[in-house]
Structure formats: structure tokens, C-alpha cells
């Protein structure tokens, strides 16, 4: 009796089950009563990432260093390669294709994450006590300056994009 | 590179015996299925036997069942037909060939068996 | 048994010229069964087309076959000197026995 279905790493062809090929490895002729799956390896440029029965490898991805791309971890037979960014710029998707320039924290916004080759600079909003005056994608906010360890009084309060100004205190006559 | 040679034919009396073998290179042996197949002079193509990679499925042309068997031989990458009670029209050109579900993709280049008195 | 009657038995013709082969199954035959073979005087056959339709390594895109149930071709396009040799067709799709056509020999005129 033929069979319907077949175990795991098997196919099933012309009523009868086969072995697929191995991760790394293409299928060249199918089984028969006589004669195991023929599989051969996939050449230098290319992969197979599962078990499969696949006639034909999958090129390697290739990292174009003119949409800013270059090689994180090269590609095996079972494998893909892996793109990242060069320095300064960043994926525009999960699957890396193309890079974008990382973007800055504008005045009043800090870093708070750096970025990364896959990710974006991730901004916040300087909270009370914090500033930043300068387009950055590396700065943080940082904290006004403390009049009182100067031994200084306040003379112009802080903003989220400006220090407090300090000056001498008044002296009482 | 991949390579089927056949040798152990000859000139042989009716009623009596042969054995001819075939050994392989360039490929894994113990993976595929390996056949026989015969050309009488001047004729066509018989098929023979089959065999199965591992060893565990043989079947043969009605005209040879009974008499010829067919084995191989794993560990030394060949395979055989053992020929017996021969007649004269078993006199042929005896080629062994790779099973693949693409047909016999490799053939090996012959031996001549003569059956006569 | 599937018996396979090929036709015709002999093709005479001129390099350049288009051969047109002709195999007939007894019965259906699933056409991922069947293969042809050219076969030189003093040679080993060679597979040529398997599948019906598929070409084997190495073998030129002059040579083509074609044909599904009980009606099969080859097709060699044009004649090379190298192509005049006899023609099998094979079917392993129903076994035992795995069966040969009678042959057709393409000739020169």
C-alpha cells in the first residue's frame, strides 16, 4: 500500500517517501525503490537553510557597500550573509537592505539610546533640571550647572536647551 | 570522475556458470540502486536486474529469473551478476548502470558473454 | 508489461536536417518515467532525455523531447555528423521489467 504521508525530513513523491536534502545541500534527483534522495552541496555564493527539496540553492545576500552596507557575518551553505551599516548609518528595515544616515537629537531633546548599525539614534525630551543646546545623535541632556557648589546664585533660569546662568550674590550692604 | 567498469565475461559453455562484476567510482555506491542491462549482437536493449541500494530489492526480467542473480557489495563498491545454467541466448554485451529517477544516467562500457558449445 | 514500439525503425537523412523520433506505450506511461538513450556502434548507451521532456547534463538544446501518456518524440533540430547513432526510449515507471523500445536508427542518407 502506497503511502499518504511521510515521517519527518521526508517527502513524499509518485507514491513514494524520499529523504530531503540537508541544510547546505540541493536536490538533484528524487528517490526511487532503489536509490536514495541525491543531494549535492550548494556552491560557494550560495545557501539552503532547511531541510528541503529545493532544486536550485539561494544566492548569499549580498551587502552593498554604495547603499552604505557591509558584512556582519559572512554566509555559509546553511546560512545567509548578514548586513549591517558602515559607521553612521543605520538599516531602514528588519531585513537590511538599504542604510540611512542616523538622525540627531535636535536642542531640548538628549540621546538616549546611541545607534546602532541596525538601529536609530532613539531621542528624549530633556526633563527639569536638563539641557541640551546642540544637534547631536551621541550627546545626552545634561545637567544644569549647580549655583550653590559655585557659591553662586541663579541668575537666569534653565530651559530644556539652556544651562542656568549663574552670578555673584548679592551682598548685603 | 564517475565510473562504472564491468569485467568477468568470456566464452562459456551451455548449462554452465558465470559471474560478472562491475565496480564503481566516483560516487557514493552505497547510495544508489544499480541495474544490468544486455545487448544481444545486432539487437537491442534487455533490461536484466535491479538491485536496491541497500540490498533488499531485486527483481529480474522473466527470461533470467531463476537462473541469474544479482548482489553487490557495499564495502568493496561493487556489484555482480551471477549467471547460472546459461543458454545461447543469453550471449550478450552485459552493461551495469546507475539506477536515478532520472532513468540509467550512467552506464558502464561492457562485457561480452559467449555461450556456446 | 508495457511494451514500447518505436518508429521507425530506420531514419535516413542529411546533417541538417530535423529528425523526428517516434516511441508508443502499450499503456499510459507517467511521463517522469520516460527516458531516451542514443547508443554509438562499439559504445555504452548515454542518457539523453529523462522525464519525457528533460534534457541530461551535458546533452545540447538540439536535442528535445516532448509527449505525455502513450505518444512520445525526440526531436533532434538540426543534424549534426555526431547525431547518427540508434535512438531507445525507456519507461521506469512500471516495473518489472523496466523496458526498452526496439531502437530507431537514424542514418545518413
Known amino acids: 500500500e502506497p503511502p499518504t504521508a511521510c515521517r519527518e525530513k521526508q517527502y513524499l513523491i509518485n507514491s513514494q517517501c524520499c529523504s530531503l536534502c540537508q541544510p547546505g545541500q540541493k536536490l538533484v534527483s528524487d528517490c526511487t525503490e532503489f536509490t536514495e534522495t541525491e543531494c549535492l552541496p550548494c556552491s560557494e555564493s550560495e545557501f539552503l537553510d532547511t531541510w528541503n527539496r529545493e532544486t536550485r540553492c539561494h544566492q548569499h545576500k549580498y551587502c552593498d557597500p554604495n547603499l552604505g552596507l557591509q558584512v556582519q557575518q559572512k554566509g555559509t551553505s546553511e546560512t545567509d550573509t548578514i548586513c549591517t551599516c558602515e559607521e553612521g548609518l543605520h538599516c531602514t528595515s528588519e531585513s537590511c537592505e538599504s542604510c540611512v544616515p542616523h538622525r540627531s537629537c535636535l536642542p531640548g531633546f538628549g540621546v538616549k539610546q546611541i545607534a546602532t548599525g541596525v538601529s536609530d539614534t532613539i531621542c528624549e525630551p530633556c526633563p527639569v533640571g536638563f539641557f541640551s543646546n546642540v544637534s547631536s545623535a551621541f550627546e545626552k541632556c545634561r545637567p544644569w550647572t549647580s549655583c550653590e557648589t559655585k557659591d553662586l546664585v541663579v541668575q537666569q533660569a534653565g530651559t530644556n536647551k539652556t544651562d542656568v546662568v549663574c552670578g555673584p550674590q548679592d551682598r548685603q550692604r | 570522475q564517475v565510473q562504472l567498469v564491468e569485467s568477468g565475461g568470456g566464452v562459456v559453455q551451455p548449462g554452465r556458470s558465470l559471474r560478472l562484476s562491475c565496480a564503481a567510482s566516483?560516487?557514493?555506491?552505497?547510495?544508489?540502486?544499480m541495474h544490468w542491462v544486455r545487448q544481444a549482437p545486432g539487437k537491442g536493449l534487455e533490461w536484466v536486474a535491479v538491485?536496491?541500494?541497500?540490498?533488499?530489492?531485486?527483481y529480474y526480467a522473466d527470461s533470467v529469473k531463476g537462473r541469474f542473480t544479482i548482489s553487490r557489495d557495499n564495502s568493496k563498491n561493487t556489484l555482480y551478476l551471477q549467471m547460472n545454467s546459461l543458454r545461447a541466448e543469453d550471449t550478450a554485451v552485459y552493461y551495469c548502470?546507475?539506477?536515478?529517477?532520472?532513468?540509467?544516467?550512467?552506464w558502464g562500457q561492457g562485457t561480452m558473454v559467449t555461450v556456446s558449445s | 508489461e508495457i511494451v514500447l514500439t518505436q518508429s521507425p525503425g530506420t531514419l535516413s537523412l542529411s546533417p541538417g536536417e530535423r529528425a523526428t523520433l517516434s516511441c508508443r506505450a502499450s499503456?499510459?506511461?507517467?511521463?517522469?518515467?520516460l527516458a531516451w538513450y542514443q547508443q554509438k556502434p562499439g559504445q555504452a548507451p548515454r542518457l539523453l532525455i529523462y522525464g519525457a521532456s528533460s534534457r541530461a547534463t551535458g546533452i545540447p538544446d538540439r536535442f528535445s523531447g516532448s509527449g505525455s501518456g502513450t505518444d512520445f518524440t525526440l526531436t533532434i533540430s538540426r543534424l549534426e555528423p555526431e547525431d547518427f547513432a540508434v535512438y531507445y526510449c525507456?519507461?521506469?515507471?512500471?516495473?518489472?521489467?523496466?523496458?526498452f523500445g526496439g531502437g530507431t536508427k537514424v542514418e545518413i542518407k
Open positions: 538491485i536496491s541500494y541497500h540490498a533488499s530489492s531485486k
Open positions: 548502470a546507475r539506477d536515478t529517477s532520472r532513468g540509467h544516467d550512467i
Open positions: 525507456q519507461q521506469y515507471a512500471d516495473y518489472p521489467p523496466f523496458t
Open positions: 499503456q499510459s506511461v507517467s511521463s517522469s518515467y
Open positions: 566516483g560516487f557514493t555506491f552505497s547510495s544508489y540502486g
